[in-house]
Interface confidence: low
């Protein structure tokens, strides 16, 4: 049976021995995971399971990712004939891709007496634990290191059955069970020493593709029992046709329109319905760094900018609290969104003894740093003392207004004496109701902020008995004068709504480095960014016109085309296989000889690193 | 005159983690990109990973999601904290400036990857 497309693939678990329910309930679970099943994806774990389950439902699994676990059962015969290959992805015990242990039951004869496992020619990763199995016959009759690629895996074959027959006369002692088709598949320990993996012969040419796991019927990838690393359409390769390929005429990696993903084991051209795609592979779920977009009707999982979105419950009406307090501080940790209100009142920062509820610590209102969004209001009547501006909300950039407080307010801050700036830096857009800040005794720059650029509509303002502006400006707590006249949410170059200049990752400068400095930079609009690393500095010039690659004015490494690059490309896939270059005398990147295939000094094909094909055996990739 | 001084290399478990220093001097630390590069036996200097003067973090794809580079200006000082290490990633480890990393200007701390 060679390597084809279309398998049935089934989730494997994940409980070790911990199992619940009875015999009978393990049986139907067993049966409904892998009834049909080809591929595991996962582990493969039978545990206490009766001496009467009929197992014959596993007879066409054809590969385990994970591992083998056999553990506690009274059958006699665990049917795996088309097993080929378990990869060992995961492995038992911390190293163990087979693991069979006691299965017998010391009251009755139930046990298990024989593992046939007749196909079974390739362990990718992990060793082999059979213990303690009283009536197993032939384990220690198979050459396991034919089996297992590892040379340093452990196998521990030992205390199994005593009182077992021998292998038939037409094995040479190496047998899954008694008859002559029980016979152990030799596919490495017989091969020719020029074979690096498997053979389907003795002789020298009779190796298999380097690809291939546990075997074959040919020496071409297509003749594989199973595959090493994917199967693209009954080939056996290292990699899928991967996302992006190197474009020669544009120096670039581009979008390859062939490209397949990894799915388990196989090259698919999409990945499965409840599936999304990572970089290059299928995978359940995104990693925690990462969210879920759908781009021209792919689900595919994208690194998100910073945190990761995530709403939250806010606080008030409809809410399950009052205000932010010690008992659901910690439910905001990492939110970027809060879906409701966010009200701070003195019960809930010095405690409600009613309530059973303790001070709040200071420190922890530093989880709002995260928040961008706020759907409803904020409300603020109650501050620490020693916290002088509402920094924590230094990233917060819209409050929406969709509920709101009292009398019609999105913003409302009264009552907190010892406040002497807002600190909201971000904040960009108040949506929809009243802004209300009264009776903050101390607080200044409010009276710079132009509220009417952050309101959609006429900003309704209601703001009275702070500290009077000439009292601010007297003491010199006005914007600083890098700030434009928009105005400014308290002190310094980074408290601006905008810059009278420059702008440097939300700071206010009065010019971008462009020519000097140690770190370069371009502009784009009135903010400034560092060139690309591979850019090198240009002594009293420009550096570089843009943030990519293809934008400096002289390269810190090398230059592949109009890209600076930290090295010349070195096997980096292209649309007829890999593509090596080397650095010429002037640092450009130019093509090996075509026929090189480790890269090269030079152009010619004396100057190929390691083995240079014959040249009827590549074909060319021309730059 | 530039010195770079790296630590915190060591023998560890493959999945297990280590964490590098480099303290830098002789030169405006806070002004530079600094780059960890790695050496494995009998190959040439690989790059790792690069910050930005103000903290802009870059990674080659091996090590993406496992390692994460970091800076204190104020201590002079890049870090380098590998995770779920794998035995790919024994080498010797060099701090270095956006100069070129064929010869090291340091003297780096070797990490191996073993069970």
């Known amino acids: 049976s060679e390597v084809g497309n279309s398998q049935a693939v089934c989730p494997g678990t994940l409980n070790g021995l911990s199992v619940t329910g009875d015999a009978e309930n393990q049986y139907q679970t067993l049966y409904k995971l892998y009834e049909r099943c080809e591929v595991v994806m996962g582990n493969l774990e039978i545990v206490l399971t009766g001496h009467n389950a009929d197992l014959s439902f596993l007879q066409w699994i054809r590969e385990v990712t994970g591992y083998v676990l056999v553990a506690m059962n009274e059958f006699s015969t665990l049917p795996l004939p088309n097993l080929r290959v378990v990869r060992g992805t995961q492995v038992y015990d911390g190293k163990f891709a087979i693991f069979v242990m006691l299965n017998y039951n010391t009251n009755s004869s139930h046990a298990l007496r024989q593992l046939r496992l007749t196909q079974l020619t390739e362990i990718l990763s992990g060793g082999v634990y059979i213990e303690k199995n009283d009536k197993l016959c032939h384990m220690d009759t198979i050459d396991w290191r034919d089996i297992v690629r590892d040379r340093d895996a452990e196998i521990v074959v030992k205390d199994n059955g005593r009182s077992c027959p021998p292998c038939h006369e037409v094995c040479k002692g190496r047998c899954w069970g008694p008859g002559s088709e029980d016979c152990q598949t030799l596919t490495k320990t017989i091969c020719a020493p020029q074979c690096n993996g498997r053979c389907f012969g003795r002789a020298p040419n009779e190796c298999c593709h380097e690809e291939c796991a546990g075997g074959c019927t040919g020496p071409l990838q297509t003749h594989c029992f199973a595959c090493r690393h994917f199967n693209d359409s009954g080939a056996c390769v290292p990699l899928c046709p991967q996302p992006l390929i190197y474009n020669k005429l544009t120096f670039q990696l581009e979008p390859n329109p062939d490209t397949k993903y990894q799915y388990g084991s196989v090259c698919v051209r999409s990945c499965p319905h409840n599936f999304v795609v990572d970089q290059s592979s299928c995978v359940r779920a995104c990693p925690s760094n990462k969210m879920e977009v759908e781009k021209n009707g792919l689900k595919m999982c994208e690194p998100c900018a910073g945190l990761c979105p995530k709403a939250c419950e806010g606080t008030g009406a409809g809410s399950h609290y009052q205000t932010v307090d010690s008992s659901n501080i910690d439910s905001f940790v990492n939110c970027t969104k809060i879906l409701g209100n966010l009200d701070f009142l003195i019960t809930g920062l010095e405690g409600d003894p009613w309530r059973n509820i303790s001070a709040l610590d200071p420190e922890k209102l530093n989880v709002f740093r995260t928040v961008r969004e706020i759907t409803g209001y904020l409300n603020i009547q109650s501050w620490p003392k020693h916290m002088h501006n509402f920094s924590v909300f230094s990233n917060l950039e819209t409050i929406g207004g969709r509920s709101l407080y009292n009398r019609g307010f999105s913003l409302l801050i009264m009552k907190n004496d010892n406040v002497t700036s807002l600190g909201l830096r971000s904040l960009r857009e108040v949506s929809a109701g009243r802004v209300y800040i009264t009776e903050n005794r101390r607080l200044c720059y409010l009276h710079t902020v132009q509220w009417a650029a952050l309101s959609r509509r006429r900003a309704d303002l209601d703001i009275r008995n702070n500290k009077p502006r000439g009292k601010c400006q007297q003491e010199g707590k006005v914007c600083d004068p890098l700030c434009s006249a928009d105005g400014c949410w308290g002190p310094g170059p980074a408290q601006c709504l905008s810059c009278r200049h420059y702008s440097r990752r939300g700071v206010c400068v009065e010019s971008c480095s462009f020519t000097q400095g140690e770190t370069r930079e371009f502009a784009e609009g009135t903010e400034c960014f560092e060139c690309h690393p591979e850019c090198e500095r240009v002594e009293g010039g420009i550096t570089c016109n843009g943030s990519g690659a293809d934008t400096c004015t002289r390269c810190a490494h090398y230059r592949d085309g109009p890209h600076c690059v930290e090295r010349c490309p070195e096997g980096i896939l292209g649309e007829r296989g890999p593509i090596y270059k080397y650095p010429d005398s002037s640092r450009e990147c130019r093509p090996c000889h075509e026929n090189c295939t480790r890269g090269c000094t030079g152009p010619l094909l004396q100057d190929c690193l390691g083995d240079a094909l014959p040249s009827a055996r590549r074909a060319p990739t021309v730059i | 005159e530039v010195q770079l001084v790296e630590s915190g290399g060591g023998l560890v478990q493959p999945g297990g983690s280590l964490r590098l220093s480099c303290v830098a001097s002789?030169?405006?630390?806070?002004s530079y990109w600094m780059y960890w590069v790695r050496q494995a036996p009998g190959k040439g200097v690989e790059w790792v990973s690069a910050i930005s003067p103000g903290g802009v973090e870059r990674y080659t794809d091996s090590v993406k999601g496992r390692f994460t580079i970091s800076r204190d200006n104020a201590k002079n000082t890049l870090y380098l904290q590998m995770n779920s290490l794998k035995s790919e990633d024994t080498a010797m480890y060099y701090c270095?400036?956006?100069?070129?990393?064929?010869?090291?200007e340091s003297q780096g701390t070797q990490v191996t990857v073993s069970s």
């Open positions: 270095a400036r956006l100069t070129s990393f064929a010869t090291p």
């Open positions: 002789g030169f405006t630390f806070s």
